[in-house]
């Protein structure tokens, strides 16, 4: 008799999930020789152990602690780039500006980027059919808890000037419900972090508005200031030119505002 399976509202586990996690771990350790001490099979076992045989609405940060321990990594605390709703540009930036890091430039972030996963209570099976949706089903699902855990740790590690890239094309440039707004902002350590500098990325070619005056940016400034961290904001009017100037800073056109 086929066993009844819980139907969730979100997409199921990404196909080839175990193979992808293991392969990414191996790639990461090849690309980053300083992480060669990591045993990728153990990393996969710890990742699997966090959600397999557990109810996918009952996952805790504690479940991910063995994985967090194995993936412990030191990144320069003053070279952290946070982002919200503008992942691709943030990653293009750190590809060029090699000394800066997004969460996805760390081992744990790289392993899970763009993947979905969940298991089922009391069975060792991975659910490839459906996984809980954060809004429609539950917030304590394997994917959400993972990102909350790694994002908190990443923000806690930050020091000096922390940068955040924000999407100026969205109605809420700063969204309190995003991972940045709900987790990272509240876990920056005022005794270590001096300034949060927001880079507001413009979408329109002819958009010359000062988006640093947007009400949601003012809200971010207020939250940050209350936490005894200074706040600054810059408009990036031309993201394409911005990236080009990061690549070639000596270019004569790079002295003007971007």
């Amino acid at each position: 008799v086929p066993r009844w399976r819980q139907q969730w509202s979100g997409p199921g586990t990404t196909k080839r999930f175990p193979e992808t996690v293991l392969a990414r771990c191996v790639k990461y350790t090849e690309i980053h020789p300083e992480m060669r001490h990591v045993d990728c099979q153990s990393v996969w076992d710890a990742f699997k152990g966090a959600f397999i045989s557990k109810h996918p609405c009952n996952i805790t940060e504690e479940d991910y602690q063995p994985l967090m321990k194995l993936g412990t990594q030191t990144v320069p605390c003053n070279k952290i780039l946070l982002w919200s709703r503008i992942k691709d540009l943030a990653h293009q930036f750190t590809q060029v500006q090699r000394d800066m890091f997004t969460l996805e430039d760390t081992l744990l972030g790289y392993l899970a980027d763009d993947l979905t996963w969940c298991g089922e209570f009391n069975t060792s099976k991975i659910n490839y059919q459906s996984c809980p949706d954060w809004r429609k089903d539950c917030s304590n699902n394997p994917v959400s808890v993972f990102w909350k855990t790694v994002s908190r740790r990443f923000a806690e590690a930050a020091c000096d000037v922390v940068h955040v890239m924000l999407n100026g094309s969205r109605s809420k440039i700063f969204d309190k419900n995003s991972t940045f707004g709900s987790v990272e902002v509240h876990n920056l350590q005022p005794e270590k972090v001096q300034t949060l500098e927001a880079w507001v990325i413009h979408g329109g070619r002819e958009d010359s508005r000062d988006l640093c005056q947007d009400p949601t940016i003012k809200e971010l400034e207020s939250i940050i200031s209350k936490r005894n961290i200074q706040f600054s904001c810059k408009n990036i009017y031309r993201p394409d030119k911005f990236l080009q100037c990061v690549k070639n800073p000596e270019d004569s056109s790079c002295t003007s505002e971007i």
Epitope: E19, A23, V26, K27, E30, I31, P33, R36, H91, Q95
Partner: antibody, heavy 120, light 107 residues
């Protein structure tokens, strides 16, 4: 079985560019970093750079920084290495190579090589 | 960049001889050294990875040792098919670097 098949020999003029391809088969292309290594006639091997085919992220040896572009086409499971501003010293055999899980970080898998001859 | 110095550059030996090739790194590379065999017109073949691990299918007469800055490839009893050029490579630090090669010729 696992194969890396490279494009054919090229003869190029000084100052021009060459683009060498490496088509992967027998494994999931995005699961392995692809490296490029070259060897001038009678010389040692020289690592040029890598690409992570999943994201397109690359790293190129300082020596080639301004002249080498490594790209990939995921749909074709193919990696490319383009070398510009060619000079006579770029006459060499160019190889793509990759590692294998559980075999350290050496290259057990190599393409057959592509001969690039640069003439004035 | 890390320099790898291989010695000797040339080596004349007879079938049955024991052959030793050394590779010295300009700084510590732990055990992240691999050895390759290359024959004319062919791609290199991986023999030894992580200093001392024989790759699948490589005959037992090939062995590797060393760690830190000094590494050795030994062929216990040279066979006719072993006449080739041998390279060490370090993968401990980017960029990867290769030794200058050791050509093993028939005496």
């Amino acid at each position: 079985q696992m194969q890396l098949v490279q494009s054919g020999a090229e003869v190029k003029k000084t100052g021009s560019s060459v683009k060498v391809s490496c088509k992967a088969s027998g494994y999931t292309f995005t699961d392995s970093v692809m490296n490029w290594v070259r060897q001038a006639p009678g010389q040692a091997l020289e690592w040029m750079g890598w690409i992570d085919p999943e994201y397109g992220r690359t790293d190129v040896a300082q020596k080639f920084q301004d002249r080498v572009t490594i790209t990939r086409d995921r749909s074709m499971s193919t990696a490319y290495m383009e070398l510009s501003s060619l000079r006579s010293e770029d006459t060499a055999m160019y190889y793509c190579a990759r590692t294998k899980y559980n075999s350290g970080y050496g290259f057990p898998y190599w393409g057959q090589g592509t001969t690039v001859t640069v003439s004035s | 960049d890390i320099q790898l110095t291989q010695s000797p550059s040339f080596l004349s030996a007879s079938v049955g001889d024991r052959v030793t090739i050394t590779c010295k790194a300009s700084q510590n590379v732990d055990s992240d050294v691999d050895w390759y065999q290359q024959k004319p017109g062919k791609a290199p073949k991986l023999l030894i990875y992580k200093a001392s691990n024989r790759y699948t299918g490589v005959p037992s007469r090939f062995s590797g040792s060393g760690s830190g800055t000094e590494f050795t490839l030994t062929i216990s009893s040279l066979q006719p098919e072993d006449f080739a050029t041998y390279y060490c490579m370090q993968s401990n630090t980017h960029p990867r670097t290769f030794g200058g090669g050791t050509k093993v010729e028939i005496k």
